[in-house]
Amino acid sequence: EGSEREENVEKEGLCNACAWRQNTRYSRIEAIKIQILSKLRLETAPNISKDAIRQLLPRAPPLRELIDQYDVQRDDSSDGSLEDDDYHATTETIITMPTESDFLMQADGKPKCCFFKFSSKIQYNKVVKAQLWIYLRPVKTPTTVFVQILRLIKPMKDGTRYTGIRSLKLDMSPGTGIWQSIDVKTVLQNWLKQPESNLGIEIKALDENGHDLAVTFPGPGEDGLNPFLEVKVTDTPKRSRR
Amino acid sequence: EGSEREENVEKEGLCNACAWRQNTRYSRIEAIKIQILSKLRLETAPNISKDAIRQLLPRAPPLRELIDQYDVQRDDSSDGSLEDDDYHATTETIITMPTESDFLMQADGKPKCCFFKFSSKIQYNKVVKAQLWIYLRPVKTPTTVFVQILRLIKPMKDGTRYTGIRSLKLDMSPGTGIWQSIDVKTVLQNWLKQPESNLGIEIKALDENGHDLAVTFPGPGEDGLNPFLEVKVTDTPKRSRR
Amino acid sequence: DFGLDCDEHSTESRCCRYPLTVDFEAFGWDWIIAPKRYKANYCSGECEFVFLQKYPHTHLVHQANPRGSAGPCCTPTKMSPINMLYFNGKEQIIYGKIPAMVVDRCGCS
Amino acid sequence: DFGLDCDEHSTESRCCRYPLTVDFEAFGWDWIIAPKRYKANYCSGECEFVFLQKYPHTHLVHQANPRGSAGPCCTPTKMSPINMLYFNGKEQIIYGKIPAMVVDRCGCS
């Protein structure tokens, strides 16, 4: 009977240790979750569903590249950099999806693309690269496409509402659609310097028959093909002051 | 009586706290001392007196600059770099004083200058800069000085024991002596690749009358005027492997 | 170079680094695009006076302590960041570096 | 940005950074040419569960603990190096950087 009690005590000890381990593991992970939110300057975890992510997540090369760049952490964790030891996360790339704007309305009241909202935290002089990525739908026959990016401005006396940012001519072959990037660094820097000048842009990609191939509002099966802005910034973390 | 006891207890408490504080302060500093020795890879604190330091410490510009470069820590400690968090100290500059060598003996058995001993830890490809600093005694009249740095080699068939490293001609005005630096990076790198080739060097700085102005063995009032080697290295701390 | 490594079956009582994987998918953090999981690790164990002591900047004596700190304790002495790709809840995807997310080494401090 | 600063007269019981000057001249370390003294600072104080917790990589619960680690403890969460000029006892003067010599911030870990 004594040995049975001993065995029970031992089992109980193991169970306690096990429960304790589970408990501390849970506490540890909870604490890490709090940390991550704090380091990313988020008050709560963004409320976004898997479906919403699937729709929003661009299918474009830069995103694939970012995801492929790491696994995100290899087993060999020390391959990473040495700890620079300031608290908050440093941002390297911001991928911004278009949002709706009052300025960008069609005659029928439907929104037009595209308005990009920027955080006042992005400083214009920290922008290293800014690319507008647009997806051009597949063509059935070889065709030349005229891509035009226009910037919406306050109406001028002659009624002009747009001014050109970039235009390019490219040849498309039948098959799959293509992602095209356009350098918009100067425009973005101006928007950051004068936020009131950011009224939105219009994207046109006309083939020889005048059909618009640019995906601005994704149709069925076009999730992740929205235009988006890829902004690379240098983020030298501020030193903490005491 | 009660209040007196209370007062005593309170005093005792303060004393205890005070003694504890002294004690922990001592412990903390002792631990920091152990740390420093460990980080500098020293088993014990080098046994060197203030007088020996005064004699050895070069009076040359690079040393003053190193001392002035930092306070060594300003009040604003965070002005320093962020912690790279690897354990050991990284070396940036090594100032090496000459030591005696069997090869470098004069006919009368007195040692000649200069033999520099190097740690096998210095890798030749990590050397960024290597300067030999020599002090030239003051002259009474304007004169031209011929500085010659010779490298001691194993005797050749024709009896040659030296080969030139550098020679330069400079004009000296009356007044105080001057420090002159000579680039010896290539020589040092060769010595590091082939340590057996490092037999020493000879320094000559002859004025127009054939007097040697180079301080090789300091006389009275010439402490800190020895020749020395200033070696700047890039020391990328090795990542720890697990 | 200092720092013990252990696993959950280890009998080591001294300060040691143990494995801990944080799995974002497991607790429904779909907003983190990558990584889906990462090895955070943690520190645990007892600290004798000088054992593994890296930063001697905490209390180092086991005596009555007016400020309630209990001598050196087992804590990270080397950490590294991870890169992360995530939605920030404002129609933006951010790629950045988060400092001090992985424990590379533990010691007494 | 986290981290409390206190002095010796402070009544703060929570985890805090306190001043500590290390004076090499005072204990006869003449072989250190510069600095002659430096501000090392130290950490001391009590840790509640989440207070000031920077690195959640140590034990975080106050329960019977098979490995004897007593919950989060007050420890450096940011450190910086100092530059030092010193004799190494081999006829050489070295100028280099010594990591983790100054406590810039304390937290519970």
Partner: antibody
Framework: QVTLKESGPVLVKPTETLTLTCTVS????????ISWVRQAPGKGLEWVGI???????YYASWAKGRLTISKDTSKNQVVLTMTNMDPVDTATYYC?????????????WGQGTLVTVSS | DIVMTQSPATLSLSPGERATLSCTSS????????LSWFQQKPGQPPKLLIY???TLAYGVPSRFSGSGSGTDFTLTISSLQPEDAATYYC??????????FGQGTKVEIK
């Protein structure tokens, strides 16, 4: 012959910037520290700043933010620039070889140049 | 800030007398000996007399000597000569690129 010679404007208006040049001969600026020291009329010497042999700069605390010292080794010149001049900056400005208080620094001085700050 | 105090402000002595000038620093000079003494005559730049607290500069007469360590230093002129009438300054170095001069002691010959 080893010499140092200061040159620059004699008169500067308040709020203006002072630029002084120290031209050396017989001195190799890549081996020698150069200091600037000033002396207000009837007053004592006041350390201003140094440019080291390797080009590092050290400034007196009162001068930080206003002072810049630079050098052009090929021209044998060291330049002192002080912004936002004030009548209290009226002084004779000297350049000297080496650093007074370190080794035999300050063994050689220029003759000095008197700068008056007045509107 | 560092303060270097020289005393006396003025010293009036006869030729052949011994002059003792004092310099006190508010903090220890670097390595206890980063201190120099300078002589300045009206209309002239300063002249280096002593460095490393006690080392006589090149070409300076041996009647000048320096002593002291840390924060307290003395310049002694063993036998005053008429040409020694001048203002004397001490200069200290503190590491960290910090240097300072004393306010000067004026030596007059009666």
């Amino acid at each position: 012959q080893v010499t140092l010679k200061e040159s620059g404007p004699v008169l500067v208006k308040p709020t203006e910037t002072l630029t002084l040049t120290c031209t050396v001969s017989g001195i190799d600026l890549s081996h020698t520290d150069i200091s600037w020291v000033r002396q207000a009329p009837g007053k004592g010497l006041e350390w201003v700043g140094i440019i080291s042999y390797a080009g590092k700069k050290y400034y007196a605390s009162w001068a930080k933010g206003r002072l810049t010292i630079s050098k052009d080794t090929s021209k044998n010149q060291v330049v002192l620039t002080m912004t936002n001049m004030d009548p209290v900056d009226t002084a004779t400005y000297y350049c000297a070889r080496g650093v007074p208080a370190y080794s035999h620094g300050g063994d050689l001085w220029g003759q000095g140049t008197l700068v008056t700050v007045s509107s | 800030d560092i303060v270097m105090t020289q005393s006396p402000a003025t010293l009036s002595l006869s030729p052949g007398e011994r002059a003792t000038l004092s310099c006190t620093s508010s903090q220890s000079v670097y390595h206890a000996n980063w201190l120099s003494w300078f002589q300045q005559k009206p209309g002239q730049p300063p002249k280096l007399l002593i460095y490393w607290a006690s080392t006589l500069a090149y070409g300076v007469p041996s009647r000048f000597s320096g002593s002291g360590s840390g924060t307290d230093f003395t310049l002694t002129i063993s036998s005053l000569q008429p040409e020694d009438a001048a203002t004397y300054y001490c200069a200290g170095g503190y590491g960290g690129g910090r240097y300072a001069f004393g306010q000067g002691t004026k030596v007059e010959i009666k």
